[in-house]
Every structure is written in structure tokens, then in C-alpha cells.
Amino acid sequence: APFDDDDKIVGGYNCEENSVPYQVSLNSGYHFCGGSLINEQWVVSAGHCYKSRIQVRLGEHNIEVLEGNEQFINAAKIIRHPQYDRKTLNNDIMLIKLSSRAVINARVSTISLPTAPPATGTKCLISGWGNTASSGADYPDELQCLDAPVLSQAKCEASYPGKITSNMFCVGFLEGGKDSCQGDSGGPVVCNGQLQGVVSWGDGCAQKNKPGVYTKVYNYVKWIKNTIAANS
């Protein structure tokens, strides 16, 4: 298969240990999605990652080994966006309130919400414990990272005619080979220190002319702030 020579995230690299301190793993007996810590008690993830019971795991690097920096906190509230659409994956965003506050330290810290929409060409960091194979499956134990640019909305819409809403944007490489994949959902896309995207969907992974599609967090800043205020 074409892209198997460099198979991390797909086509990424092993993150330096705890270098993505806002990255969380959502666990229901096993890792199933990622997420981002946005304050001591709240996590942003994808709407399609909804489950009635979730344990949030912070400070993780190797999800199969207890390394000493982890904080495991159960979800107290799980709030999917009211307009989430399962079929189109529009409004694919969710908030999780932790049952206790996370202890903020060098290995567990928050990521800022965006103050402006993502600009075309901006280099972003995508991370997660998702599949590292574009064909087949190879799930890593250690957190994977990928540096990838924001694509123009025109290129995004051309890649997925009729499927891209104003709440979505594309990040990645039209030549294929580098992308997020299954198991990365809900995880962060951070550009210039701000959480611009949430891993959402795509046609396969790392396929030519089929970049990853991400929830545009900027469009939900007001909803996030209002929801946190109403549930504090």
C-alpha cells in the first residue's frame, strides 16, 4: 500500500512525552476518542464520541502503561451540541465536565479557545492514539503527532462536494499520506497555541484528495462559554 513506510497517526511521529499536555484520552474500558482540556474541569471532544459513561484520562503518553503522570477523572456531565447531526456530522462537538478539577502541572494543562477562525496555510498540530495505517489497522500505545496545514475552504469543498458545512474545515495534504484516522476523533487541532479544530471525519484516512475534516471550534466559542457558565 502507498504510505506504509512512515506509519504514525498516519504519516506523523511519536510525540515527545507529555509535550501535548492538553490532550486527553476518553476511555470506556479502552481508549475510543481523544479530547482537549480547555479549563480545569472541562474537556472539548467530538459529538460523535458521545457515550453515557466516560472516564477522562489526562497526562497520558503510553495508554497501555501507568507512567506516573496520569489523572483519571470520571465525567460528571456529557453535553453534546444540541444541533449535532449524526448523518452529516454537522456541529460535531461535545463538552465534558469532569467530576473533579484536574491538577494543572507541566504535564497536564489547558489549551486556549480560538480568538479568530483558522487561516489558510497555518501550520497546526494534530495528535491522537488513532490508527497509524492508511489501509488495515495498527493502533499505537504512544501518542502520535502530525504537523499539517489548514487548507482553503474551496479546496476542502472540492474534496467533498456538498458535504462541507460552514462548521467544518480541512487540514492536511491533498497528496495523501498524512492524516488523522480512526481513534483520533475528538482530539485537538492546535494552531498558534489555540484549539482551532476537533478531529471529526474523512473518506478513509490519508487518501489522495481526501483530507481530514475537522469541526471549526471558532464557531462554537460562545456555545462553549455559555454551556460552561450554565453548568458550573
Epitope: 492508511s134 495498527d138 493502533y139 476523533s185 478513509g204 484516512c205
Partner: antibody, heavy 128, light 108 residues
Framework: QVQLVQSGAEVKKPGASVKVSCKAS????????MHWVRQAPGQGLEWMGA????????NYAQKFQGRVTMTRDTSISTAYMELSRLRSDDTAVYYC?????????????????????WGQGTTVTVSS | EIVMTQSPATLSVSPGERATLSCRAS??????LAWYQQKPGQAPRLLIY???TRATGIPARFSGSGSGTEFTLTISSLQSEDFAVYYC??????????FGGGTKVEIK
Amino acid sequence: QVQLVQSGAEVKKPGASVKVSCKASGYTFEGHYMHWVRQAPGQGLEWMGAINPYSGQTNYAQKFQGRVTMTRDTSISTAYMELSRLRSDDTAVYYCARDFVLLLRQSRILHESAFDIWGQGTTVTVSS
Amino acid sequence: EIVMTQSPATLSVSPGERATLSCRASQSVGSNLAWYQQKPGQAPRLLIYGASTRATGIPARFSGSGSGTEFTLTISSLQSEDFAVYYCQQFHNWPPLTFGGGTKVEIK
């Protein structure tokens, strides 16, 4: 309804090749991996490989690398498995099976795969 | 390659009794595990996926549990139609996809 219909039984001589077809109906053919599994008489299930009908990408078990070729014709929703240089121990029932995980507009949650639809099986006998 | 080991190879059970089948993976497969039932002359049939989720149309007497390396298929009260061979299969890391060697459930 969703089904996979395979071609009929084959009798081949050692050294020959066999090509088994698997016609899909009732779903979007390009949207799901198609796998091939074989079962020798009285034995267990053995995975041979898979094809992504959307991209054409293939993955083969090491054991069959160089002898197996998996292809597809999306215009007629059919997958093919060709096995060359046949030996007597290739005598088996060959199955195609659909992975139920959707490949298109696929959310990136950790998907739990499984073969939800199987073909009826094609018996291939290799005998001199 | 992840090796899947099923035990026992044969299980003799009386109708109405409980049957417990085991499947062990040589390394963690998370919850990426499926169970199939196969009767003579038939293609396998999906019973359980995601280690514990019953497939469409599968009776509630079939249940799956476990994650990581240890998995169990339980048939709470065996019916005559349940006597068959059962296979586990991992999807966590492939190629290759690997099956266990099977457990034959026979009438005692």
C-alpha cells in the same frame, strides 16, 4: 437485502491459478473493506487479505504474498481473489466477507470492525 | 502478528446449561474483537463485535466480555441450535487479521 454471492466450485490442477468472484448487492460496494478468508477441510478460518474497494488498496497475509491478487470492478460491485501456483494444500472453501465499518464519510472514532456479511463460500479443489 | 488462542478446543455441555468460551490475545487488542459461530457446511455468522456488542438478530443468551488480552463468550442457556464451532478474531492490528483456532461446543 445485503448479500454477497460467490462464483461456483472449481477443480484445478497443481500449478494452475483460480479466480473467485464475489458480487455484492444491497449496499454501497465502495464503502466497505472486502476480506477473503479460507477454510481447509476440518480446519479453522484463515485470513488471506483484503481490498478497499474505494481506493483499490490491498493488504495480504504474508503467507500468500506473491501468490494472491485481489481486485475489484466497482461498475458491477464485484470483488475478485486470484490465487496462483496452486498446491494440494490450497484445497479449501474460500469466503468473501464484508467489514461493516463504513469507509466513506467515516467518523474517526475507534471503530470496532467485524465481518457482518459473508458469501456462501466457493469450494476449490486442487488435485492432479 | 497477534496470536489468538482459544480454550478449550472442545466443550461438552448439556442443553440448558451455561457455556463459557475463552479467547486470549498475545498482546492487547483493546476491544477490537469479534466472535463468530459456524455450523457444518455453512459460512460463519457474526455474534459479537467490539468484544461485547451483540450483532443484529443475535439472541440475548449470547454475551461477550473482556478487553485487552482476555475475552469470554458466554452462552447462558444452550439451545440445540447453539452446538457449533465458535471463533474469535482480532481487528486491532492488521495485516494480518487473526482468528483463534476455534472451540467446538458439542452435546454432552
